[in-house]
Interface confidence: low
């Protein structure tokens, strides 16, 4: 089999791999996150939920202890019992959702008659939450803003230095003409340059 065909088949197989299911909920509403672990007749299970952090780390607090952002997390399926017979057991109930609840959650099912562990992931997207306060937005993107400003200052310094060096070396002897100096104003003026380069807030999100 040719390498190209192998790569094509591999990419097809990858695209067919089951994606982590996503649950969308409107801000401040309650949501039931289903446990997507593969079901096995070894029941009843004891379920535990964790929220996965961006770095792959796990927030190890148990959801039923209400540690996650002060929200109320309710587990059905603990010790094989659940609230309503028509509801899927082992789901995670999050009340009064906020944008903080968005993220990836993992459920782990443990069988007391053998400790068989099964796990599944689900992504929660909380939509329609009011915009964050300006200081929160600034805190969130502080590193990006500082880096951007540093780059702007660096390029400004480089341009100014280049222009001065060029003038000193008389590379551009005719550039002292008024018309040409006016042409360079947008570049050499830091305020105007910043105005051209600084992205709008929407671009930072």
């Amino acid at each position: 089999m040719s390498r190209g065909l192998q790569l094509l088949l591999l990419s097809c197989a990858y695209s067919l791999a089951p994606a982590t299911p996503e649950v969308k909920v409107a801000c401040s509403e309650d949501v039931d996150l289903p446990c997507t672990a593969p079901w096995d007749p070894q029941v009843p299970y004891t379920v535990s939920w964790v929220k996965l952090l961006e770095g792959g780390e796990e927030r190890m607090e148990t959801p039923q202890e209400d540690h996650l952002r002060g929200q109320h997390y309710h587990q059905k399926g603990q010790n094989g019992s659940f609230d309503a017979p028509n509801e899927r057991p082992y789901s995670l109930k999050i009340r009064n959702t906020t944008s903080c609840n968005s993220g990836t959650y993992r459920c782990t099912l443990q069988d007391p008659d053998g400790q068989r562990n099964l796990s599944g992931k689900v992504i929660l997207r909380v939509t329609g939450c009011p915009a964050q306060r300006k200081e929160e937005t600034f805190k969130k993107y502080r590193a990006e803003i500082v880096l951007l400003l540093a780059l702007v200052i660096f390029y400004l310094t480089l341009i100014i230095f280049t222009c001065k060096f060029a003038r000193l070396q008389s590379i551009f002897p005719d550039f002292s003409k008024a018309g040409m100096e006016r042409a360079f104003l947008p570049v050499t003026s830091p305020n105007k340059h910043l105005g051209l380069v600084t992205p709008h807030k929407t671009e930072l999100v």
Epitope: P44, D113, R116
Partner: antibody
Framework: EVQLVQSGGAVVQPGRSLRLSCAAS????????MHWVRQAPGKGLEWVAA????????YYADFVKGRFTISRDNPKNTLYLQMNSLRADDTAVYYC????????WGQGTTVTVSS | LTQSPLSLPVTLGQPASISCKSS???????????LNWFQQRPGQSPRRLIY???NRDSGVPDRFSGSGSGTDFTLKISRVEAEDVGVYYC?????????FGQGTKVEIK
Amino acid sequence: EVQLVQSGGAVVQPGRSLRLSCAASGFTFSTYGMHWVRQAPGKGLEWVAAVSYDGSNKYYADFVKGRFTISRDNPKNTLYLQMNSLRADDTAVYYCARRGGLDIWGQGTTVTVSS
Amino acid sequence: LTQSPLSLPVTLGQPASISCKSSQSLVDSDGNTYLNWFQQRPGQSPRRLIYKVSNRDSGVPDRFSGSGSGTDFTLKISRVEAEDVGVYYCMQGTHWPRTFGQGTKVEIK
């Protein structure tokens, strides 16, 4: 008391159908996976089929695939085994059992397939 | 699963041992080993004695014990009593389909 009470066993002709029932009591039936195991006369135990607590997952032994169907009615606390196209070698005592570890067993019901 | 011996005549009060060998490892991806032992007395339904290799079910006398790992497992009866007569089966719960051993008939000499 936790128990499984079976019914539905009978003498049937080859090619005919039969439905076995297993009524559960003394535990929350809807939270347990359930199994069917059979035992031919003078032989050992043979696993037949299993169903997850909510009926969404079903597993079968190769020799019954396409002929037998396992199902459950949680509100009625009852497990079923629908047996179609019965053959002489399906003659056995059929047991229902609870969860993957088969910790509780029914009393068994006899199915005889004979012409 | 292959059990041996298929027949085990024992003297009351003496120990008995039954072997169960699997053609493949019974260690699950979760690290656990799902090997159960059942007792079937004459004319009765099977009864589970041991689950997950060595865990005794409630109500099971402590003269019954299970051991082993991977593919080789053993059920031991430290002192056989008259009520222990019957057929003993091992069963694996790691792979689908579930499978039983052929059974070992324990009888008094």
